[in-house]
Amino acid sequence: EINGSADHRMFSFHNGGVQISCKYPETVQQLKMRLFREREVLCELTKTKGSGNAVSIKNPMLCLYHLSNNSVSFFLNNPDSSQGSYYFCSLSIFDPPPFQERNLSGGYLHIYESQLCCQLKLWL
Amino acid sequence: EINGSADHRMFSFHNGGVQISCKYPETVQQLKMRLFREREVLCELTKTKGSGNAVSIKNPMLCLYHLSNNSVSFFLNNPDSSQGSYYFCSLSIFDPPPFQERNLSGGYLHIYESQLCCQLKLWL
């Protein structure tokens, strides 16, 4: 079973926007990662593999992202600062099988005027 | 390709709550059905099969539901009556393959005081 881990920073700030990092195990080869704000899907990224070493990335919501072998980071330029919102990552694992879906670590994000600080409670 | 169909009533009222019916083809054996209000996931039901005929039902959002061989009905006790909301069903098909995701029929639901009438526009 895969759970979120508190050993990474889920939120970080860059140029007035926020980067939200969704970690996954390095053993996962094909996956879908979704970022939720409360229960709203903000971003979705799917990585699948071809017969060779080719990788296909689908990003239907056109989010800015960075993909590594153990995390997907989404970049939100205008996070909702009206109130603290709860963000969490949802991981669908296609490979290795069997198919699994897991909600990963989440946290409350409070945006202040400077957008350089956040009050964060990790949910494990 | 699977699309929503207008040959069923998506909304019906019972005991002050609303039943929202999400149809799917009878050929689908393993699936996930999600109910959205706008972009918010209200309910989610996953049906998978084991090696024998055992069926596993996962209902992580603890919605009241009824599952048949061609529909999932979700029961909302306190639908948002502050304004008309757009509800739609999203179907993920695991079996038979290939994996597919489809948005099914949707409609605008306007709740009146009596909760016995709704103004509905089906989206096909």
Epitope: G50, S51, A54, F94, D95 | P96, P97, P98, F99, Q100
Partner: antibody
Framework: EVQLVESGGGLVKPGGSLRLSCAAS????????MHWVRQAPGKGLEWVGV??????????YYSDLVKGRFTISRDDSKNTLYLQMNSLKTEDTAVYYC????????????WGQGTLVTVSS | DIQMTQSPSSLSASVGDRVTITCQAS??????LSWYQQKPGKAPKLLIY???LLAEGVPSRFSGSGSGTDFTFTISSLQPEDIATYYC????????FGPGTKVDIK
């Protein structure tokens, strides 16, 4: 009902060419990786090659035994897979199967019943 | 290319017997190994994928185990309808089949 039906097999002389077809129905052909596998009379199964889906730019990969001589192609609009075989050798004599595979999120594969190719003078 | 070896090449067993076939890969293939059953004049049928996961509709008397380079396929109680040739196949890098194991009844 899922069906894969191979056709185009027959007798051909060494050095000759042949084109096999595989007509698919009952599933979303364009979502599947399509392989050719062959089996010489009384022998085991041997993978020939594969063509990936549009998401992977229809990439093709071949076994060393056929590389440079065989070409796999597909027409998603016709739900059809092809195998163009050139410079045929007697050791290419086999039943040729087309197979469809998918692994996301569950692993499935479908096989045709095969078509016999005989290379002989 | 990854090479696959299988043993034994053939075996005879009685109905109800436990049958075991081994498969070895020339390099680490993680768990990307499947097992097929082929009856004379028929196309192969997928039984097991990813080393130990049963394909849809396959009886539970079939099972698989292993990881890396060494794998095992087991029929817990041989039935008359299990008479066939069994192949392992790696799909870690393209596809390669083992040479097959012919199973028949004593």
């Amino acid at each position: 009902e899922v069906q894969l039906v191979e056709s185009g097999g027959g007798l051909v002389k060494p050095g000759g060419s042949l084109r096999l077809s595989c007509a698919a129905s009952g599933f979303t052909f364009s979502d599947y990786f399509m392989h050719w596998v062959r089996q010489a009379p009384g022998k085991g199964l041997e993978w020939v090659g594969v063509i990936d889906t549009k998401s992977f730019n229809y990439a093709t990969y071949y076994s060393d035994l056929v590389k440079g001589r065989f070409t796999i192609s597909r027409d998603d609009s016709k739900n059809t897979l092809y195998l163009q075989m050139n410079s045929l050798k007697t050791e290419d004599t086999a039943v040729y199967y087309c197979t469809a595979t998918i692994a996301v999120p569950y692993y499935f594969d479908y096989w045709g019943q095969g078509t016999l190719v005989t290379v002989s003078s | 290319d990854i090479q696959m070896t299988q043993s034994p090449s053939s075996l005879s067993a009685s109905v109800g017997d436990r049958v075991t076939i081994t498969c070895q890969a020339s390099q680490d293939i993680s768990n990307y190994l499947s097992w097929y059953q082929q009856k004379p004049g028929k196309a192969p049928k997928l039984l097991i994928y990813y080393t130990n996961l049963l394909a849809e509709g396959v009886p539970s008397r079939f099972s698989g185990s292993g990881s890396g380079t060494d794998f095992t396929f087991t029929i817990s109680s041989l039935q008359p309808e299990d008479i066939a040739t069994y192949y392992c196949q790696q799909y870690y890098n393209y596809r390669t089949f083992g040479p097959g194991t012919k199973v028949d009844i004593k």
